[in-house]
Structure formats: C-alpha cells, structure tokens
C-alpha cells in the first residue's frame, strides 16, 4: 500500500531571465527512493539516480542545474518555460510517485514564490 | 569507492588570496555536486556553496559570495576554491564534499586555513 | 535563513542509555539531515530525509521530525558514538547547519 505523499513549490512565478528552484519532497513513507525524474510536459529534464548521481538531458544542459538536494534549478527563465513540471519518485517497494509544479514565467517585476518551500 | 583528496594546509598572509583542491576519484565527477563547507570552533560548520561540474553551475551563501569562487576542472576531476582578501576571520578548516540528491556522502579530510598578520 | 538551534549543546550518557538530541528549525522545514563527527576528522553522513540510516551506521540510531522540530535517537548508547552531531537543512537557500550536541560518553 502506497502511504506517502509528495510536498511541492506547487504554482510558482518568476520573472524572465532569472532562475527559479523547482522542489519536491516526498514524505510519509519508508520506501526507499531509487530515482527521481524531472519532467517538462513529457520532455524528459534530468535524473537524479541514488546510485549514479545525476543525469542532466543535453538539451537542457545550459540551463538546467542540480539542486539544491532533490530540487532543480532553471536558469535563463524565458516565457516558453512556463507549464507543468512534474517530480517522478520512483521507489521500493512503493512504486512511483509524482508531484507537480506549475511554473508561470512574467514579463514583469511581480513574481510571486509558491509558500511551501522557500525560494532565494 | 569515492574519495576526495584536499590540498594540505595553508599559511597565508592578510590581505593575500588562497586557492586550495580537492580532488575526486571512485565516481563520475560531473554527476554530482561538490559543495564547500567552512568549520570553525565558534561558528561550527557554515555552507559556502557548491558547483555542478556537469555544466559548471555555481550556487553560493550569499555570505561567501565575492569572497569565495568555485571552479572545477573536469579533465583531471579536481574541484579548487579560491578565497580572497584573507583576514583572521577566515582561519579555518575547509571541507568539499559531494552530494548526490541525498545529503553530502562522502567528505574530504579538510584543507586547514591560518591568516596570518 | 533558516536557524538550525539544537539541544543540548553538551549532553554524557552511559552505556546502554537512551540517548535524544534536538535540532529546532526556525522555520518549517520538509527534512532534516544529520552528521557525525568525531574530534580530528571529517563530519560524516548519519540520517538523511529526517529517519534514513546511511550505510554502516547502526540500527541503534533512528531518526524523525516535522516542521520546525526534529530528532536524533540512540536507543543504547555505545562507547563508539561519542562524537558531535550536527543537523543540516535545505529547505532554503542558504543551507544551514545547527551549532552541534556534543555526546560524550560518561
């Protein structure tokens, strides 16, 4: 039986050209957790491997930096970047569990961060 | 098995710059964080930042910034930081350790710092 | 930035005590991680996310929290976990480590 559950940033804005830390926690639940993924729509970002560390997909790979822990950073924010992003746990003996994030990039200085987690 | 190698330690001058290593082996050095970690007797340990060697992405406590730069050389898995315009505030012993999504795993043995006046 | 206070700062236990130390976040916080460290070396991965044991350290230590408060349990105490333990955070930029509880065996 699945128990846990994942905390998001949940919807966030930021404005265009700056960065934003998107993060996912998963909580409740002593699966251990192998792999996350990190998802745009159904384009693949980067994975975090509990074994191999990180993988960051080569079209992403200017842009899209690590951390901090499980979190990812986008970097160079242009307005095509707002969407869904998703945080795919995969764990055992769970299975998998996502989260989901929903950036909006503005054109302007009123950006405001999700509350959740703290964004610098 | 990885492992990191830090340079030994420093006795530098005030005012001057110091730049010290640590060198990674046992793991594929663009896959994970290397973060930098300051200990000192009265302020224990403090975050000063850490770069993705992957892409060369830095992120650093807004304390250290301008007084800490982070580079790494991925052809010889090294990770350096440079630290400026020394005072004795900045004696102390500094730590890289990776990180890999789950906290920092593995240490080096630390690089002692001594300002000298 | 989020203040990591734990307490004890010093604490002695004796062997086969039960041991627990605190690290309060001034901030809510989704996870806590802890570090070992002994006198002369490096700090040392103990717990992460809040309750996983990292490799080769003993069942006897366990972990747990939420929000703001967190905790590291040593059901008996043993001769060899004498050492300081820090807690460290990254819910927000900048990550921060708590000052220490010093567990010396008594």
């Known amino acids: 039986m699945m128990t846990g559950t994942i905390e998001t940033t949940g919807n966030i804005s930021a404005e265009k050209g700056g960065s934003i830390i998107l993060q996912c926690h998963l909580s409740s639940t002593t699966a251990q957790v192998t792999q996350v993924n990190w998802e745009q729509q159904d384009q693949l970002l980067a994975i975090c491997n509990a074994d191999l560390g990180w993988h960051i997909s080569p079209s992403f790979k200017d842009r899209v930096a690590p951390g901090p822990g499980l979190g990812l950073t986008l970097q160079s924010l242009t307005v095509n970047d707002t969407g869904e992003y998703f945080c795919i746990y995969h764990t055992y003996p769970d299975g998998t569990y996502t989260g989901r994030i929903f950036l909006e990039v503005l054109e302007s200085s009123v950006a405001e961060h999700g509350a959740r987690f703290q964004i610098p | 098995q990885a492992y990191l190698q830090q340079s030994g330690a420093e006795l530098v001058r005030s005012g001057a710059s110091v730049k010290m290593s640590c060198k990674a082996s046992g793991y594929t050095f663009t896959s994970y964080n290397m973060h930098w970690v300051k200990q000192t007797p009265g302020q224990g340990l403090e975050w000063i930042g850490y770069i993705y060697p992957g892409n060369g992405f830095t992120n650093y406590n807004q304390k250290f910034k301008g007084k800490a730069t982070l580079t790494a050389d991925t052809s010889s898995s090294t990770a350096y930081m440079q630290i400026s315009s020394l005072t004795s505030e900045d004696s102390a012993v500094y730590f890289c350790?990776?990180?890999?999504?789950?906290?920092?795993?593995?240490w080096g043995q630390g690089t002692s710092v001594t300002v000298s006046s | 930035q989020i203040v990591l206070t734990q307490s004890p700062a010093i604490m002695s236990a004796s062997p086969g005590e039960k041991v627990t130390m605190t690290c309060s976040a001034s901030?809510?916080?989704?996870?806590m991680h802890w570090y070992q460290q002994k006198s002369g070396t490096s700090p040392k991965r103990w717990i992460y996310d809040t309750s996983k044991l990292a490799s080769g350290v003993p069942v006897r230590f366990s972990g747990s929290g939420s929000g703001t408060s967190y905790s590291l349990t040593i059901s008996s105490m043993e001769a060899e976990d004498a050492a300081t333990y820090y807690c460290?955070?990254?819910?927000?930029?900048?990550?921060?480590f708590g000052a220490g509880t010093k567990l010396e065996l008594k």
């Open positions: 460290q955070q990254w819910n927000s930029n900048p990550s921060t």
């Open positions: 901030s809510s916080v989704s996870h």
């Open positions: 350790a990776r990180e890999g999504g789950w906290a920092m795993d593995y």
